[in-house]
């Protein structure tokens, strides 16, 4: 009998509000034994996979998807899904990435603290939309 796979989680480092031109890394987490992580975007058809999976803890594995220079087109909803043979998990909740103009003011922090919860986390409709776009293991640049 196949095991029930836990839903993955998604977070963003250093946060979910990123100044234009700065970098952001999406972190997808799942159980140990994950072969492939896929990062998808709502409403876009692009995606990427990575098999560069590391062990984050004795019970958890993770993959990181980095965008070196965030553009306005990177704003939007992102989610993760993973493949642990012989099947895919459900999707994670959506994480919303916000892109803001660089203010440069010393009183305004560049980013929010990294978080996988809070107002930027949205439920993913797993009944149908298994199929939104995604991003890659090392770089996630073409998820515009």
């Amino acid at each position: 009998q196949e095991e029930d796979l836990p839903r993955p989680s998604i977070s963003a480092e250093p946060g979910t509000v990123i100044p234009l031109g700065s970098h952001v890394t999406f972190v997808c987490r799942g159980p140990v034994g994950v072969q492939t992580f896929r990062l998808e975007r709502d409403s876009r058809s692009t995606y990427n996979d990575t098999e560069d999976v590391s062990q984050a803890s004795p019970s958890e594995s993770e993959a990181r998807f980095r965008i070196d220079s965030v553009r306005e087109g990177n704003a939007g909803l992102y989610r993760c899904i993973y493949y642990k043979p012989p099947k895919w998990s459900e999707q994670s909740d959506y994480l919303e990435l916000l892109v803001k103009e660089s203010s440069g003011g010393p009183d305004s922090p560049d980013t929010e603290p990294g978080s996988s919860a809070g107002p930027t986390q949205r439920p993913s409709d797993n009944s149908h939309n298994e199929h939104a776009p995604a991003s890659q293991g090392l770089k996630a640049e073409h998820l515009y």
Epitope: T36, S43, R44, S45, T46, P85, P86, K87, H131, Q136
Partner: antibody, heavy 115, light 111 residues
């Protein structure tokens, strides 16, 4: 590559299963769609098996066909075909990195439904 | 159900000329869109996807544009080898499933 098989001449109402066989890539990562083309007509979408195990059908195909997959194949079962189902049937795999385009197509398999 | 209306049904142009084919979707489909070329007796060939990215091996004479509901395929510097039927397709699998649908096709005749 992908290649269709199972096309043949059958009488109306005779169930028929077409198979799309994948080689040279890991099928688990990809969506596979089935498309058909009646003689002299345009392309008609039948349905798809997505990488995550979901199956979708065109509205006209619901109840008329069933799509299923294994680790290396995606089957299209025609439950009770009629003469209107005579066509060349294609399967296709989406492009790496983008769900919107299907770059890998099989040569097609001809299905003839006739009494 | 999603409908893709492709125009014109047929178009003729001279070698070296330009052809424009349009595809209108009945609902917004974002970037879930592609153009294919098919010649008699052959399988369809992916030209453009996403909906402006050139598929591998396709010359830049082929250009795709648009998003949402309006899409355009432009073929410039027409060659005899471009004579074929061209189809648009949406393969959107969203929360409100729109599915895979083809346009009716456009026959391109090169004079």
């Amino acid at each position: 590559s992908v290649k269709e098989s199972g096309g043949r001449l059958v009488t109306p109402g005779t169930p028929l299963t077409l198979t799309c066989t994948a080689s040279g890539f890991s099928l688990y990562k990809y969506n596979i769609q089935w498309v058909r083309q009646a003689p002299g007509k345009g392309l008609e979408y039948i349905g798809a098996s997505t990488y995550a195990g979901y199956t979708y059908y065109a509205s006209w195909a619901k109840g008329r066909v069933t799509i299923s997959r294994t680790s290396t194949t995606v089957d299209l079962k025609m439950t009770s075909p009629t003469t209107e189902d005579t066509a060349t049937y294609f399967c296709a795999r989406h492009i790496d990195g983008d769900y919107s385009g299907y770059a890998l197509w099989g040569p097609g398999t001809l299905v003839t439904i006739s009494s | 159900e999603l409908v893709l209306t492709q125009t014109p049904a047929s178009v003729s142009a001279a070698v070296g000329g330009t052809v424009t084919i349009k595809c209108q979707a009945s609902q917004s489909i974002g970037t879930w869109f592609a153009w294919y070329q098919q010649k008699p007796g052959q399988s369809p060939k992916l030209l453009i996807y996403g909906p402006s990215k050139l598929a591998s091996g396709v010359p830049p004479r082929f250009k795709g544009s648009g998003s949402g509901t309006e899409f355009t395929l432009t073929i410039s510097d027409l060659e005899c080898a471009d004579a074929a039927t061209y189809y648009c397709q949406s393969t959107y699998f969203g929360v409100d499933y729109l599915g895979g649908t083809f346009g009716g096709g456009t026959e391109v005749v090169v004079k």
